[in-house]
């Protein structure tokens, strides 16, 4: 009679993580008597997956009635497959004895597990940057298999080209990770912009995964200042306004200086938002010119988002205004308003 053969018809089997994998194995003879065992890997470090004779293997079930006397089908099903289950599985026939001895092994079936990538996580720079600067964003996704994966970067729907991507590890692995760094040049209009990392993989059924970063968390748009003198409100009062325009984020402190001396400090609270996401704010100072003998240098000094202060000055000509007799006290007011002076 022809010697028993162990037939594993499938060289490879590919399943999705979470599915069950069926590993086929048949023998061509009932002789010699003895059990079948399944192993992952070969050699002394091989891992026992299933033993027909004994043991508890909760994820493994036999496809046919392996306990029947004349059964020659020893195929198994492994449930809830994970990437860690990838490897080559061998169906091995043992000859009954004390102990049982290995008689013949099948050629092996390579199980590959198709696992979805994790949701991409996009992170930006630790510190804010101003327009015209180039900042780096990173995107990471993990746990996918097979290794082939496509990663694209977008800014507001426009594909970016300045990026570098690595898939690790370089060699064979049960699962892989991708890491990509993109360079983005900031513009003043980027407060509402988004940077998107898009990952496409065969397990995603054509629906790429996306990770986003809002440039509002990255950008700092410094304000532009304009100090103007409003028409005289009363004979001896002048209204000076400081327009703080196009800044982001909102964190801003304004100080009025008269001839270098602090007159008033206030924090931007009631601001107006521009369409591009930047803010405008206005502060005003009411100066009683009769309290001044000489010309006054008024300075609007702004500290934005913890950055060094910027300032704009305005020279108030006192000589151009008639003095009110007997008045020698300063009567100054400051205020701020979204749109109107009052």
């Amino acid at each position: 009679e022809e010697e028993l053969q162990v037939i594993q018809p499938d060289k490879s089997v590919s399943v999705a993580a979470g599915e069950s994998a069926i590993l086929h194995c048949t023998v061509t003879s009932l002789i010699p008597v003895g059990p079948i065992q399944w192993f992952r890997g070969a050699g002394p470090a091989r891992e026992l997956i299933y033993n027909q004779k004994e043991g508890h293997f909760p994820r493994v079930t036999t496809v046919s009635e392996s306990t029947k006397r004349e059964n020659m089908d020893f195929s198994i099903s492994i449930s809830n497959i994970t990437p860690a289950d990838a490897g080559t599985y061998y169906c091995v026939k043992f000859r009954k004895g004390s102990p049982d001895t290995e008689f013949k092994s099948g050629a092996g079936t390579e199980l590959s597990v198709r696992a979805k990538p994790s949701a991409p996580v996009v992170s930006g720079p630790a510190a804010r940057a101003t327009p015209q600067h180039t900042v780096s964003f990173t995107c990471e996704s993990h746990g996918f298999s097979p290794r082939d994966i496509t990663l694209k970067w977008f800014k507001n729907g426009n594909e970016l080209s300045d990026f570098q991507t690595n898939v690790d590890p370089v060699g064979e692995s049960v699962s892989y990770s991708i890491h990509s760094t993109a360079k983005v040049v900031l513009t003043r209009e980027d407060v509402h912009s988004q940077v998107i990392c898009e990952v496409a993989h065969v397990t995603l059924q054509g629906d790429p995964l996306r990770g986003t970063a809002n440039l509002s968390e990255t950008i700092r748009v410094p304000p532009t200042l304009e100090v103007t003198q409003q028409p005289v409100r009363a004979e001896n009062q002048v209204n000076v306004t400081c327009q703080v325009r196009k800044f982001y984020p909102q964190r801003l402190q304004l100080t009025w200086l008269e001839n270098g001396n602090v007159s008033r400090t206030e924090t931007a609270s009631t601001v107006t938002e521009n369409k591009d996401g930047t803010y405008n704010w206005m502060s005003w100072l009411l100066v009683n010119v009769s309290a001044h003998r000489d010309d006054v240098k008024l300075t609007c000094q702004v500290e934005h988002d913890g950055q060094p202060a910027v300032s704009k000055s305005h020279d108030l000509k006192v000589s151009a205004h008639p003095k009110e007799q007997g008045s020698n006290t300063a009567a100054e007011n400051t205020g701020s308003n979204e749109r109107n002076i009052y």
Partner: antibody, heavy 118, light 109 residues
Amino acid sequence: EVQLLESGGGLVQPGGSLRLSCAASGFTLSSYAMSWVRQAPGKGLEWVSISSGSGANTYNADSLKGRFTISRDNSKNTLFLQMNSLRAEDTAVYYCARLRFFDWFDYWGQGALVTVSS
Amino acid sequence: QAVVTQESALTTSPGETVTLTCRSSTGAVTTSNYANWVQEKPDHLFTGLIGGTNNRTPGVPARFSGSLIGDKAALTITGAQTEDEAIYFCALWYSNHWVFGGGTKLTVL
């Protein structure tokens, strides 16, 4: 058992429109990308379009110049192909096929014949 | 657009091993082209045999296997049988679209 059954084929005049359906059974449509592939009489296969599992993303053959639109109703387990501005060269048997992953045409329907002729 | 080329016809005998190939006009076929092999039998009966270069569709006999040989995708039938007589199409993925080859008519005499 996985089954794909196309319907909606027939004779249509040049410039006309037709809507093909593909009724899927034996699996949940939303878990799979689906494709339309056509075969002109005596010719080979030509890929037409893919709909992603959710239906949110579509991929179309450039040669069709936007005349064909793939869509799906996952609640009804049905795939569609809306064909507009039909031409004589669109005459073919149209097959819907399931993609096991995004890279693996595993099951095919029996096809629906579309004839464009005046 | 890329052109995918296959042998127009091949003949083999029962029990023999036969290899069908699939070439891309853009260069070497890689795993990123996700080579597919589809069988067409009379009466327009199509069966997906291989996907993603080397994954056999459940239920397809083990004698069918997919691989990359040199710069081409390949379908190997080990121990061909008379019922394997059919037309075999390969398909390759190019970033956002599939392209099918012209098909190989396999005769098993």
